[in-house]
């Protein structure tokens, strides 16, 4: 199709080389006047538009994304050619940063319902640059944590070194929806709730004598509880003896609950004590079996191919540890009678 009629938007993604970050493009379809197909909330010129659906369909995933190759080749369907780019409804997610993401991206409705709809498309010219050392040293992270129940703030990474007074007007989105009355470079949250978690996008306009473009950053906001003050506790095994049958295989499970820690390095391992000797056993990897805001339950099994007489003289010890301390639970095997 002819893309010369598409509305054009220029975006800049300045990524940090020292952190993982994502990026998004919204399918910014033009105003209803330009095409009856494209739905928009009518807003004043001062107000930024919502980025979501258009008239032609109630299905928000009814848009097609293409990339325009720089060599003039035909448009390429994003889904077929770019595994690191994911389409979610009207949004294109870039999972990894890199200058190779620079280029022109075009979106338009899948269903063309009238001749007027042909021009219902947007061309986004994306420029991707690594952040230079001259940039602000203490810029906000693209991953920000808010402590549940307390006061916090969400900062726009590309503007976090500017004071509120000198900061330009910012447009914020949360999970793809416009936050129409948030326009400063830092959103203050007086009391953090779990619903504050999500993907936030902040945009502001930068201009020079020739043109203007939108500078965009994506912030993943996580709501967390305070770090635990407790060492992990072992939920299983509860008993210190276990009845077994000689010659049969045996699996002993160790399940431990670890309280939340922002920097989480849980240890869960099995070792064997035999008179004065003790050694760690190589056992299958630990796995998380339940995770909540407050804690995580991790399980690790020790597997004996068959129980021997020697095993009855040993103690099997589960050892768990976090940054606060450690806990152990030992199990003595006992032969089942009759």
């Amino acid at each position: 199709f002819n893309i010369s009629g598409c509305s054009t938007k220029k975006l800049l993604w300045t990524y940090s080389t020292r952190s993982e970050e994502e990026f998004v493009l919204f399918c910014d379809l033009p105003e209803p006047q330009k095409s009856h197909f494209c739905h928009r909330n009518r807003l004043s010129p001062k107000q930024v538009p919502e980025h979501l659906p258009f008239m032609g369909s109630n299905d928000l995933s009814d848009v097609q994304w293409y990339q325009q190759p720089s060599n003039g080749d035909p448009l390429e369907d994003i889904r077929k050619s770019y595994p690191h780019i994911i389409q979610d409804k009207c949004t294109l997610h870039f999972l990894t940063p890199g200058v190779n993401n620079s280029g022109s991206y075009i979106c338009r409705p899948k269903m063309i319902k009238s001749p007027y709809d042909v021009a219902c498309c947007v061309k986004m010219i994306l420029e991707v640059k690594p952040q230079t050392n001259a940039s602000c040293e203490y810029s906000a992270s693209h991953k920000q944590d808010l402590l549940l129940g307390s006061t916090g703030s969400i900062s726009c990474p590309s503007l976090s070194c500017q004071s509120d007074a000198q900061s330009p007007a910012v447009t914020w989105y949360k999970n793809g929806k416009l936050l129409s009355v948030e326009r400063s470079n830092r959103i203050v949250v007086d009391e953090v709730y779990d619903y504050h978690q999500g993907t936030y996008v902040c945009d502001y306009t930068q201009s020079d004598t020739v043109s203007s473009w939108t500078v965009r950053a994506v912030v993943q906001v996580r709501t967390i509880v305070g770090d635990t003050k407790l060492k992990p506790d072992i939920l299983d095994p509860v008993e210190d003896t276990l009845e077994v049958e000689l010659g049969k295989p045996l699996t002993i499970s160790c399940k431990a609950r670890f309280g939340f820690e922002r920097v989480f390095n849980p240890v869960i391992k099995w070792y064997i004590k035999d008179s004065d000797l003790e050694w760690e056993v190589s056992v299958p990897e630990a796995k998380s079996i339940k995770s909540t805001l407050k804690d995580e339950i991790i399980e690790r099994n020790i597997i004996l191919e068959k129980v021997t007489q020697r095993d009855l003289r040993r103690k099997f010890v589960c050892f768990v540890q976090n940054s606060i301390g450690n806990t152990t639970q030992s199990v003595q095997l006992k032969e089942k009678r009759g």
Epitope: K174, V181, D190, Y195
Partner: antibody
Framework: QVQLVQSGAEVKKPGASVKVSCKAS????????MHWVRQAPGQGLEWMGI????????TYAQKFQGRVTMTRDTSTSTVYMELSSLRSEDTAVYYC????????????????WGQGTTVTVSS | DIQMTQSPSSLSASVGDRVTITCRAS??????LNWYQQKPGKAPKLLIY???SLQSGVPSRFSGSGSGTDFTLTISSLQPEDFATYYC?????????FGGGTKVEIK
């Protein structure tokens, strides 16, 4: 308890302006967005706009754009809605209503409402 | 703007009846739908948010369901204090819009 107390009834002539106040108490004023909704006699509810008391940022319904101004005074925990160039069809009860979730948020619902201010526009 | 269409516009029912009010959005609004009750001369009161979550202090006889474009408010056993006008409202995008209302009257 959380309360929104609005200013008293007003009678205005066509072409004039009216400024309605809404004083909040019982919660942190800057933590919640405030909506304005009106209801003409015997009619349904009509959303006019929203203000963020922290920064004073507003979004207005297109219908009222250019005629409505929402402001706030954080020192008195009060929001104001001024409507200008009044006409007879602006005769209505005007309500302020608190957003139900701590900002920033998707609009969740208006969980506390003022008692309403009757504005009559008549020549 | 997203149009919200409520039906019926009025209904007559008796105490103890099960009452159902429907609301349809002109486009998909996910579950961004709220229900309000308004009595004559009073301000509206939030009953249901996010299509199906019961607002604190609201009796459990009120329930909401639906997502996308079609939504329902159900009063399982109508009580004398439930005779009022009910409004749906979308909070998916600005301008926020309300349905025309359903007046529940005594039969």
């Amino acid at each position: 308890q959380v309360q929104l107390v609005q200013s008293g009834a007003e009678v205005k002539k066509p072409g004039a302006s009216v400024k309605v106040s809404c004083k909040a108490s019982g919660y942190t004023f800057t933590s919640y967005y405030m909506h304005w909704v009106r209801q003409a006699p015997g009619q349904g509810l009509e959303w006019m706009g929203i203000i963020n008391p922290r920064g004073g940022y507003t979004t207005y319904a297109q219908k009222f754009q250019g005629r409505v101004t929402m402001t706030r005074d954080t020192s008195t925990s009060t929001v104001y809605m001024e409507l200008s160039s009044l006409r007879s069809e602006d005769t209505a009860v005007y309500y302020c209503a608190k957003e139900g979730r701590v900002s920033p948020t998707d609009y969740y619902g208006m969980d506390v409402w003022g008692q309403g201010t009757t504005v009559t526009v008549s020549s | 703007d997203i149009q919200m269409t409520q039906s019926p516009s009025s209904l007559s029912a008796s105490v103890g009846d099960r009452v159902t009010i429907t609301c349809r959005a002109s486009q998909s609004i996910s579950s961004y739908l709220n229900w309000y009750q308004q009595k004559p001369g009073k301000a509206p009161k939030l009953l249901i948010y996010d299509a199906s979550s019961l607002q604190s202090g609201v009796p459990s006889r009120f329930s909401g369901s639906g997502s996308g474009t079609d939504f329902t408010l159900t009063i399982s056993s109508l009580q004398p204090e439930d005779f009022a006008t009910y409004y749906c409202q979308q909070s998916y995008s600005t301008p926020l819009t309300f349905g025309g209302g359903t007046k529940v009257e005594i039969k």
